[in-house]
């Protein structure tokens, strides 16, 4: 192969003009003829100068794998997923996501401790004795209710998922 | 020799529409492919849109994608523009120029479009 | 696209000297300009293609030269019928075919 330069690339033994980003060769250069390229059609896209024959589809972001379309495909650059709210990214693609997964649900008796983020699961913790957290949503777990000195017995014991009265 | 003339020019109001065209002789036209070429009064060249010899390829200039339609007729030996939702900035002389390898190896003496209200 | 950039922008000579009109492009077009010559009221023509093919009929005191991304058009000995805007196109790679802004030749 010959050796191009970087805005050229070879066909057989010759250096062709590049065509430039949102365009694929539709026919390479020749003896009286420079490239002719053509437009990426919808749904494809190239993002540089190339020597590409057909130009490459863009990715779907699919909404089963937690995903939604951050950046729309245009024709001289890729879509780009995100996730979807509620959900956080599991598999890291270079500067986007291709899986998400739903963050974690704090269970009752417990809180949570940090939010979910896009890269970032739900950290939830276990109730301090003491306190209680009924649904495993709150930042903070409440304080059980102390029974004033009039009552003299406890209805029962409470957990740090329910408050006895 | 190749002779090309162009007609249709004129006066528009911005938003009106023109049909121009090219008449092709001395040549054998449907072996070709062919180009509009304009040029602003006191400008430079600007190509404007490109057919191939059996209209299966076209292109045109962003400036007039999806305003303008290039079209030809092989067996009237002519070109032709439609040329809708006109701009001021769309007033220039239009040549037709017939093409050769990517070349404009022969020119008409063009038209004037103006689009002035 | 391709932009294409002329200079000098006027060119103030006298008959019987040579002239000599640069363009260079953003990016390699290959082999593939073109120069046109234009006098005013008239239609361009073709002079150079190929970089340094003189079409048919071009006095060969007209001559091209360059690849990649700068070209030359140099005319030996400038004749009165000369002096006219001269403007270099690229097919290197197109669509866009580009042209450039034009250099104007005239009598000093």
């Known amino acids: 192969l010959p050796s191009c330069k970087e805005d050229e690339y070879p066909v057989g033994s010759e250096c062709c003009p590049k065509c430039g980003p949102g365009f694929h060769v539709r026919q390479a250069c020749g003896e009286q003829t420079g490239t002719v390229c053509e437009p990426c059609s919808p749904g494809t896209y190239i993002a540089h100068f190339n020597g590409l024959s057909k130009c490459l589809q863009c990715q779907m972001c699919d909404p089963a794998m937690g995903l939604r379309t951050s950046r729309n495909c245009s024709t001289t650059a890729n879509a780009l997923c995100g996730c979807s709210p509620g959900h956080f990214c599991i598999i890291q693609d270079g500067d986007h996501c291709a899986a998400c997964r739903a963050y974690a649900t704090s269970s009752p008796g417990q809180r949570v401790q940090k939010g979910g983020t896009e890269s970032q699961d739900t950290l939830c913790q276990n109730c301090p004795p003491g306190t209680f957290s009924s649904n495993g949503t709150l930042e903070e777990c409440q304080h059980g209710t102390k029974c004033s000195k009039w009552l003299v017995t406890e209805a029962g014991p409470g957990t740090s998922s329910f408050r006895w009265v | 020799e190749v002779q090309l003339l162009e007609s249709g020019g004129g006066l528009v109001q911005p938003g009106g529409s023109l049909r121009l065209s090219c008449a092709a002789s001395?040549?054998?036209?449907?072996?070709?492919?062919m180009h509009w070429v304009r040029q602003a009064p006191g400008k430079g060249l600007e190509w404007v849109s490109s057919?191939?010899?059996?209209?299966?390829?076209?292109d045109y200039a962003d400036s007039v994608k999806g305003r303008f339609t290039i079209s030809r007729d092989n067996s009237k030996n002519t070109l032709y523009l439609q040329m809708n939702s006109l701009r001021a900035e769309d007033t220039a002389v239009y040549y037709c120029?017939?093409?050769?390898?990517?070349?404009?190896?022969?020119w008409g003496q063009g038209t004037l479009v103006t689009v002035s209200s | 696209e391709i932009v294409l950039t002329q200079s000098p922008g006027t060119l103030s000579l006298s008959p019987g000297e040579r002239a000599t009109l640069s363009c260079r492009a953003s990016?390699?077009?290959?082999?593939?300009l073109a120069w046109y010559q234009q006098k005013p009221g008239q239609a361009p023509r073709l002079l150079i293609y190929l970089g340094s093919n003189r079409a048919s009929g071009i006095p060969d005191r007209f001559s091209g030269s360059g690849s990649g991304t700068d070209f030359t058009l140099t005319i030996s000995r400038l004749e009165p019928e000369d002096f006219a805007v001269y403007y270099c196109?690229?097919?290197?790679?197109?669509?866009?075919?580009?042209f450039g802004q034009g250099t104007k030749v005239e009598i000093k």
């Open positions: 001395e040549f054998t036209f449907s072996s070709y492919a």
């Open positions: 057919i191939t010899s059996a209209s299966s390829y076209i």
């Open positions: 120029a017939r093409g050769t390898r990517g070349l404009f190896d022969h």
């Open positions: 196109q690229q097919y290197g790679s197109s669509p866009p075919i580009t």
């Open positions: 990016r390699s077009v290959g082999k593939y």
